[in-house]
Interface confidence: low
């Protein structure tokens, strides 16, 4: 069927349109185009005779039309009056006629729109604003954008006048935004420039900062006022109702108690004509006295005396605070505070209670601290220690012993040999000693303030012969590749050489062996099972030598990868399967079996009588050493064949 297609259907003024013919019949004589929906000679645009290829203009021809041999019609430089229907009349060679009608619409190219407003400075919560999109254009659609977003849904927003007018009722400060309008028709779309809505608002209730309302005499008062407002607010300050100054900040240096009172900030917006005020009450306090601590006992005795510390002066309705060692008071049954917190009592003082102690008086603004006080706790003497630690000496050397005991005041020392007083000194010196100097050496420490005494006795042996040494160890069961072991040769003796043997041999050279402490200590790093040997230490001097009894190191190791025996993997049906698992381990490991992943028994030997091909599969032995915390396993594949089916098979166990 003959049809006409308009390309495009919507045409912009000044552009062109092509009326494209589809399904044009064969064997034509000619055709004519008419303006309108029917064939009307008065409205013929152009005719075309195929035989002569001659185009003849009609009454409606404007000079902007071009006809093509395929009957399509191009109209150029389109004007508004071109809108409407166009009819093609086709005359076939058999003089039978056929008609088809097409149409298009013409629209103007839109100009760039602009926004007009009925109120350039609306007041918040009071005014409405109507924006209108100019110019008014027929067949145009109007759209609005706020901050480049489509209009939000709001009961305060209303579109009217075919969406050409946007009204904002009861404007708020949040309506301050960029507004644009857009005009659209089928052939063009244009957006206006932005219009910024300037909403007048405020002032809101001002805020005064800082929020602090308490000050100390002598400080500076610096208050700042701010209120949300458009245009910005003008500020005024009043103190106790009296105008002070028209500034946003109020500064008063070196305030006194007389500056206490009500401080008012007033904010004024000249455009809205509104005023708002905020009041803050400022209190100025006088400087309190510095506290100090008194004590009822300046030299308390440890574990005997109590001490009461009192914070002075006594002030009514005051909070007292305490600190020990710059920390708040620890929770302790030996620390007690009086009801008003002014007195701190230490029950049964110890040497650790020396302090320092501080008390504080809290006022409305801050805490004033006392100077620190340190307690002089009398203690001791503790059990004295005698040095050096040697107990064996050779004849002819000098004996020099020193005694020390923790004590306050420092202890007075006395030395006794075999119960007989020798001298009142901290050190005892005897030159060129002999066997006769062997005996019990007693140091006595005395605290003159507490009257307490403590003694320590040390046995000194003067002999050319050395005693039989012994070995002490810091780890009786070390784990292989993990632990270290330190052997120490006892006793410690003066001018003595220490020697070591392993399995009767002198020490091998090894980075894992280290001698220290004058060769008195032998350390084995990262012990291995090969270190499980007999260790002997020896001591010698110029006249004597002696050896210890051997100490055998018990190294925990393993389990190593287990071995399943016998090694056979093929068995005849009917044989007995007797698998034994072994893993090197100290102590002996725990054994368990898994067949094809299924747990079996916890034994070293797995026995299955009269096996069949159903017993084919993987046999896993698992070993675990609870002492080392280590585990290991191995898997063996077992194949069972029906009797006589394959030569060379094991008969089993």
């Amino acid at each position: 069927k003959l049809t006409i297609e308009s390309t495009p259907f919507n045409v912009a003024e000044g552009k062109e349109v092509l009326l494209l013919v589809h399904n044009l019949p064969q064997h034509l004589f000619g055709y004519s185009w008419y303006k309108g929906e029917r064939v009307d000679g008065n409205r013929q645009i152009i005719g075309y005779v195929i035989g002569t290829q001659q185009a003849t203009p009609g009454p409606a021809y404007s000079g902007r039309e071009i006809i093509y041999p395929n009957a399509s019609l191009l109209i150029q430089n389109i004007i508004q009056n071109d809108t409407g229907f166009y009819t093609l009349h086709v005359i076939k060679s058999d003089l039978v006629n056929e008609e088809a009608t097409g149409q298009f619409r013409v629209y103007p190219e839109l100009p760039k729109p602009s926004i007009s407003s009925n109120n350039s400075k609306p007041v918040e919560d009071k005014d409405a604003v109507a924006f209108t999109c100019e110019p008014e254009t027929q067949d145009a659609t109007y759209l609005w954008w706020v901050n480049n977003q489509s209009l939000p849904v709001s009961p305060r927003l209303q579109l009217s006048n075919g969406n050409r007018t946007l009204t904002l009722f009861n404007v708020t400060r949040n309506d301050t935004a960029s507004y644009k309008c857009e005009t659209q028709n089928p052939v063009s779309a244009r957006r206006s420039d932005s219009v910024i809505l300037n909403v007048l608002y405020g002032p809101d209730a001002p805020t005064i900062s800082p929020l602090n309302t308490s000050y100390r005499s002598g400080e500076n008062l610096n208050l700042s006022c701010h209120a949300a407002s458009n245009p910005p607010a003008q500020y005024s300050w009043f103190v106790n109702g009296t105008f002070q100054q028209s500034t946003q900040e109020l500064f008063i240096p070196n305030i006194t108690v007389n500056n206490s009172g009500s401080y008012t900030c007033q904010a004024h917006n000249s455009d809205t004509g509104l005023n708002r005020t905020t009041v803050t009450t400022i209190t100025v306090y006088a400087e309190p006295p510095k506290p100090f601590i008194t004590s009822n006992n300046s030299n308390p005795v440890e574990d005997e005396d109590a001490v009461a510390l009192t914070c002075e002066p006594e002030i009514q309705n005051t909070t007292y605070l305490w600190w020990v060692n710059n920390q708040s008071l620890p929770v302790s049954p030996r620390l007690q505070l009086s009801n008003d917190n002014r007195t701190l009592t230490l029950l049964s003082v110890t040497r650790n209670d020396v302090g320092p102690y501080e008390c504080g008086i809290q006022n409305e603004l801050s805490v004033d601290h006392s100077d620190p006080v340190i307690l002089n706790v009398l203690y001791g003497p503790d059990d004295p220690t005698i040095s050096p630690s040697y107990t064996y000496y050779r004849p002819g050397v000098n004996l020099s012993l020193s005694c020390h005991a923790a004590s306050n005041p420092p202890a007075q020392y006395s030395w006794l040999i075999d119960g007989n007083i020798q001298q009142h000194t901290q050190e005892l010196f005897i030159s060129n000693i002999t066997e006769k100097n062997s005996g019990l050496y007693t140091c006595q420490a005395n605290n003159s303030a507490s009257g307490h005494s403590r003694t320590t006795v040390k046995t000194i042996t003067v002999s050319a012969e050395l005693p039989k040494p012994s070995i002490s160890s810091n780890n009786s069961k070390p784990v292989e590749d993990k632990d270290a072991v330190a052997f120490t040769c006892e006793p410690e003796a003066q001018n003595t050489t220490y020697l070591w043997w392993v399995n009767g041999q002198s020490l091998p050279v090894s980075p894992r062996l280290q001698l220290s402490n004058g060769n008195r200590t032998l350390t084995l790093f990262n012990v291995t099972r090969n270190d499980a040997r007999a260790y002997v230490c020896g001591i010698q001097n110029s006249v004597s030598a002696n050896r210890s009894d051997p100490v055998t190191l018990d190294v925990l190791y393993g389990p190593d990868t287990p071995i399943i025996s016998p090694p056979d993997s093929s068995y005849l049906s009917g044989a007995n399967l007797n698998l034994s698992c072994h893993s090197a381990s100290n102590p002996s490991p725990q054994y368990s079996w898994r067949i094809n992943g299924i747990p079996q028994q916890h034994t070293q030997v797995l026995f299955i009588a009269k096996i069949t091909p159903n017993n084919n599969g993987t046999y896993a032995c698992f070993v675990s050493n609870l002492a080392t915390g280590r585990n290991n396993s191995i898997v063996k594949s077992i194949t069972v064949s029906a009797s006589g089916t394959s030569p060379g098979l094991s008969a089993g166990a």
């Epitope: 368990s592 992943g597 747990p599 191995i634």
Partner: antibody, heavy 120, light 105 residues
Framework: QVQLQESGPGLVRPSQTLSLTCTVS?????????WHWVRQPPGRGLEWIGY???????NYNPSLKSRVTMLVDTSKNQFSLRLSSVTAADTAVYYC?????????????WGQGSLVTVSS | DIQMTQSPSSLSASVGDRVTITCSTS?????MHWYQQKPGKAPKLLIY???NLASGVPSRFSGSGSGTDFTFTISSLQPEDIATYYC????????FGQGTKVEIK
Amino acid sequence: QVQLQESGPGLVRPSQTLSLTCTVSGFTISSGYSWHWVRQPPGRGLEWIGYIQYSGITNYNPSLKSRVTMLVDTSKNQFSLRLSSVTAADTAVYYCAREDYDYHWYFDVWGQGSLVTVSS
Amino acid sequence: DIQMTQSPSSLSASVGDRVTITCSTSSSVSYMHWYQQKPGKAPKLLIYSTSNLASGVPSRFSGSGSGTDFTFTISSLQPEDIATYYCHQWSSYPTFGQGTKVEIK
């Protein structure tokens, strides 16, 4: 404490081979235990793939056995999974896990999982 | 192969409720283990060897059973217990139940 961390590509083409590595920290692989792979298709349950021991001994799920290879590298304290000829059905979160040695065989330590998507 | 049936597949309970999940096997197994899996996380061992509480697991979780029927119980459901729970056995090879999703009403 013992930690396991899976690593490997998150996308594998169909018919190619999926490769994942599990790095063990806080424990030496050669000290024992069995080291497992378990997977979980999106929104589905858990499926065991197999395990390897430090000595190289392996045990695989029969349904995947023909496509699975597991390796262990004790020097790097790592073990790995290779799954060949993958299809979309192999898309899953793949977990490595340690089997606890309590004779009852359960998984006491897991990696956080690695999502592998099979897609062209 | 041993078939495992875990039920229910999902449940909704209130905080403080007692929650019970069952796991049945097609033939007898020695032990059952139970895991908790929260969204986007790896499974976490809760109960091993049927009734033993894993290290650091709250005592409100427990397990019991033998043969072919095993039970997992939360004595008093807490908000942090929202998860999927799986039973697990190892016979010829390891298999898991289909999972039970636990939600709070």
